[in-house]
């Protein structure tokens, strides 16, 4: 696959992850249950990140927004905050990304500095997927450990006000946001590789290390078939060798000696 | 932690009426269906009258036509008027809410009952 291709389609990969981002921040079904088992209506409540809503079978629906931060849990604070920074760090990566695109030319800038771009790009790319993959797996064990607290409590009542508070014990399954935002997180991490793959073949080649052989004819004891000698290289039939030839040469330099990659 | 307030129970004459009151207060996201029941001295505790957040109401055989259930949404209380009341209306009555209290957490909350007496 050529860099331009690799690179496009890593940003095009990353930008639809991003979007799913974004979507399942906003989306209110992180989590959903039935509360079917009730004297007035069959009653479905989803809750999001930012909001809980309840819709009843005559389709009326009502939402409530978590207007208070000190009384939400720590987990839906924390959730909330990796979900975000995913999505700056997106949004700071498309922008990097746009500039480092090979097909886009602005200005006079070079391919070593559309290769760093494009790497702090895909570098960007690669922690908002992670970011959006943690949250939603912090929510999502959330969701399993509320439930097994739940259902261990289920018999126990508290008392409030002389009253009595019981578990409803009814099962909260994950919701569409979850699985959007675990596909996302992980498209925004594949398109971050790619990008960072991209990267590499950006590198103008002077810029690179040199690949290096060396030829320390002696110790280069290859296996042939025909005894030590043919092995070796030191039979009466074999032309003479300088123990050091040069030193190290690079794979630009001629090929001037077939004995150059006889290693095993 | 989620607490009910029940108020507006007592002592009432026959064919009168009583107005009884719930709110509900504590961590809070959503109230889906809010409710009353009572139980009458030696009988099982029985539905009054219930109301969902839309409006879907449901009640009793024995008290239709007779007691109107209305809430609040906006104050999480809910209110049962209580017409032409029989003395076989006497029983202690219970404020019944469902909440979702957090996230994957839905509690059933029963009040500490209000007394209501009709009798001459």
């Known amino acids: 696959m050529s860099v331009t291709a690799c690179q496009g389609l890593g940003f095009v990969v990353s930008l639809i992850g991003f979007a799913g981002i974004i979507a399942a921040t906003c989306m209110d079904q992180w989590s959903t249950q039935d509360l079917y088992n009730n004297p007035v209506t069959a009653v479905f409540n989803y809750q999001g990140l930012w909001r809980s809503c309840v819709r009843e079978s005559s389709g009326f629906t009502e939402c409530r927004g978590y207007f208070t931060l000190l009384g939400l849990p720590a987990m839906l604070q924390a959730v909330r905050a990796l979900m975000i920074v995913g999505i700056v760090l997106g949004v700071i990566g498309i922008l990097v990304s746009i500039f480092a695109l090979k097909c886009i030319r602005i200005g006079s800038m070079d391919d070593s500095a559309k290769a760093k771009m494009t790497l702090t790009s895909g570098i960007l790319f690669i922690i908002s997927g992670i970011c959006a993959i943690i949250g939603v797996s912090v929510f999502a064990n959330m969701l399993v450990t509320n439930f097994w607290m739940s259902t261990a409590n289920m018999y126990s009542g508290m008392g409030g006000m002389g009253g009595m508070v019981q578990t409803v014990q009814t099962r909260y399954t994950f919701g569409a946001a979850l699985f959007v935002g675990w596909v996302a997180g992980g498209l925004t991490l594949i398109g971050g590789v790619m990008m960072c793959i991209a990267c590499r073949g950006l590198t103008p080649d002077d810029s690179n290390f040199k690949a290096v052989s060396y030829h320390a004819s002696g110790q280069n004891v290859a296996y042939r078939p025909g005894g030590f000698k043919a092995s070796t290289g030191f039979g009466s039939n074999t032309r003479n060798k300088k123990i050091y030839d040069g030193g190290a040469r690079t794979e630009d330099d001629e090929q001037s000696h077939p004995t150059k990659y006889d290693y095993v | 932690q989620v607490q009910l307030q029940e108020s507006g129970g007592g002592l009432v004459q026959p064919g009168g009426s009583l107005r009884l009151s719930c709110a509900a207060s504590g961590s809070i996201f959503n109230i889906p269906v809010m409710g009353w029941y009572r139980q009458a001295p030696g009988k099982q505790r029985e539905l009054v009258a219930g109301i969902s957040t839309g409006g879907t109401t449901n009640y009793g055989d024995s008290v239709k036509g007779r007691f109107t259930i209305s809430r609040d949404n906006a104050k999480n209380t809910v209110y049962l008027q209580m017409n032409s009341l029989k003395p076989e209306d006497t029983a202690v009555y219970y404020c019944?809410?469902?909440?979702?209290?957090?996230?994957?957490?839905?509690?059933?909350?029963w009040g500490q009952g209000t007394l209501v007496t009709v009798s001459e």
């Open positions: 019944n809410v469902l909440v979702v209290s957090g996230i994957g957490s839905t509690l059933e909350v």
